[in-house]
Amino acid sequence: YSHWPSCCPSKGYPSEELLRWSTVPVPPLKPASLDFHSVSCRASEDGPLNSRAISPWRYELDRDLNRLPQDLYHARCLCPHCVSLQTGSHMDPRGNSELLYHNQTVFYRRPCHGKKGNHKGYCLERRLYRVSLACVCVRPRVMG
Amino acid sequence: YSHWPSCCPSKGYPSEELLRWSTVPVPPLKPASLDFHSVSCRASEDGPLNSRAISPWRYELDRDLNRLPQDLYHARCLCPHCVSLQTGSHMDPRGNSELLYHNQTVFYRRPCHGKKGNHKGYCLERRLYRVSLACVCVRPRVMG
């Protein structure tokens, strides 16, 4: 997990205090028990939530070293429909497996410019970034 | 959405550039079509994802003005089991409705101290904060 260069350093102030990192080491924000292997359209009876779900999903890494957090994970549904609760192995077309989206706050590293327009290190720019969190088994919409 | 006081201001540098907010106005990070009303243990055939899910959930606001983002939403499951795809109303004990957790990166506003220990405005401290994102219908774990 790389640390960024100092954020908008300015004379007489220790740059490393401008964006104070947690004193606890922060690992990549990887979903717990993430398993990219042996994923298929079936609901397991053990393992992490994304593999036991009847709308199972895998995670796809989205890494950007100029963004905080640098690592985001996007859910990708493994089945178009929900898997049967009876067997965990075949689909039930009465339910759809749909992505749940969320607009997450992220910060981008951008060059800062002083009053005279000269480059003054880096600033953080706050943005909303759309991530897919999970796949959810839903009843299909009834069109009126 | 209140703006924070300047982040670690220092002489000769415009403090509002230290943490540059997006030029686009940012509304509270409220889940799309959030509806706190008429939520119950049933899967609707219309409305937002959290009400159409067979593991329906509601959202609970968690506001902290000294944190970025200031508003976070925690999912709360409305049913212990999944709702039947056939009826959308009665529960099917073959499936459990389980919370999906995520460690989200947040930033806390903390007082900054200069080399001499004097108060020098505010710094951002990065932390992981556990939020529940959604409720997912899963097959129960089989104990070996």
């Epitope: 079936r42 049967s84 009876q86 067997t87 965990g88 192995s89 075949h90 689909m91 039930d92 077309p93 009465r94 | 056939q86 004990p93 073959r94």
Partner: antibody, heavy 121, light 107 residues
Framework: QVQLQESGPGLVKPSETLSLTCTVS????????WSWIRQPPGKGLEWIGF???????NYNPSLKSRVTISVDTSKNQFSLKLSSVTAADTAVYYC???????????????WGQGTLVTVSS | DIQMTQSPSSLSASVGDRVTITCRAS??????LNWYQQKPGKAPKLLIY???SLQSGVPSRFSGSGSGTDFTLTISSLQPEDFATYYC?????????FGGGTKVEIK
């Protein structure tokens, strides 16, 4: 009226693979849970597994590592392969149609007449 | 796995008798229970599905009841052709499991 007929060798050597075929006549092979069930001599019934819509399979965990059930829609047949057999696999093997009720396997009807497979050297 | 326990394992009865066979599941299976009849050297035949529904072509003297964990197969008036072994089977969860069987013999 749907009828099922098992075929395959009646004698298999230990450690070899048991292979049986079930031919479906008088009906479509789509949208049913084509299943195999076995019955050791003088004992009860044991479900082996199914193949649904030529794709999804589900096997009894006690046999899972050794079983494959496949469907050949062009021939209106489905088959059972059970590897690494031992004397404990000696049984009458039945093929059966698992009825699709609310997108779940519900009950078995009809059944084939059954074929005795003996595992012996 | 869900265990299915049948009782009695065998019984002797006469033609015309009312016969009751019970089946107990190790956990609640709602109404996901089926009953089969098997005669020596033959394949099982479906009698009752979904705990209480009579399969087409099966005589009305056969009936099924129960839900949850306790189920009953009743033959209201035993006929000569009813002497056979009866099995219950759950379809609530895979692996699908059968009871050990109840053999109905002539007294």
């Amino acid at each position: 009226q749907v009828q099922l007929q098992e075929s395959g060798p009646g004698l298999v050597k230990p450690s070899e693979t048991l292979s049986l075929t079930c031919t479906v006549s008088g009906g479509s092979i789509s949208n049913y849970f084509w299943s195999w069930i076995r019955q050791p001599p003088g004992k009860g019934l044991e479900w082996i597994g199914f193949n649904y819509n030529s794709g999804s399979t589900n096997y009894n965990p006690s046999l899972k590592s050794r079983v494959t059930i496949s469907v050949d829609t062009s021939k209106n047949q489905f088959s059972l392969k059970l590897s690494s057999v031992t004397a404990a696999d000696t049984a009458v093997y039945y093929c059966a149609r698992g009825y699709n009720w609310n997108y779940e396997i519900a009950w078995f009807d009809p059944w084939g007449q059954g074929t005795l497979v003996t595992v012996s050297s | 796995d869900i265990q299915m326990t049948q009782s009695p394992s065998s019984l002797s009865a006469s033609v015309g008798d009312r016969v009751t066979i019970t089946c107990r599941a190790s956990q609640s299976i709602s109404s996901y229970l089926n009953w089969y009849q098997q005669k020596p050297g033959k394949a099982p035949k479906l009698l009752i599905y979904a705990a209480s529904s009579l399969q087409s072509g099966v005589p009305s003297r056969f009936s099924g009841s129960g839900s949850g964990t306790d189920f009953t197969l009743t033959i209201s008036s035993l006929q000569p052709e009813d002497f056979a072994t009866y099995y219950c089977q759950q379809s609530y969860l895979t692996p699908l499991t059968f009871g050990g069987g109840t053999k109905v013999e002539i007294k």
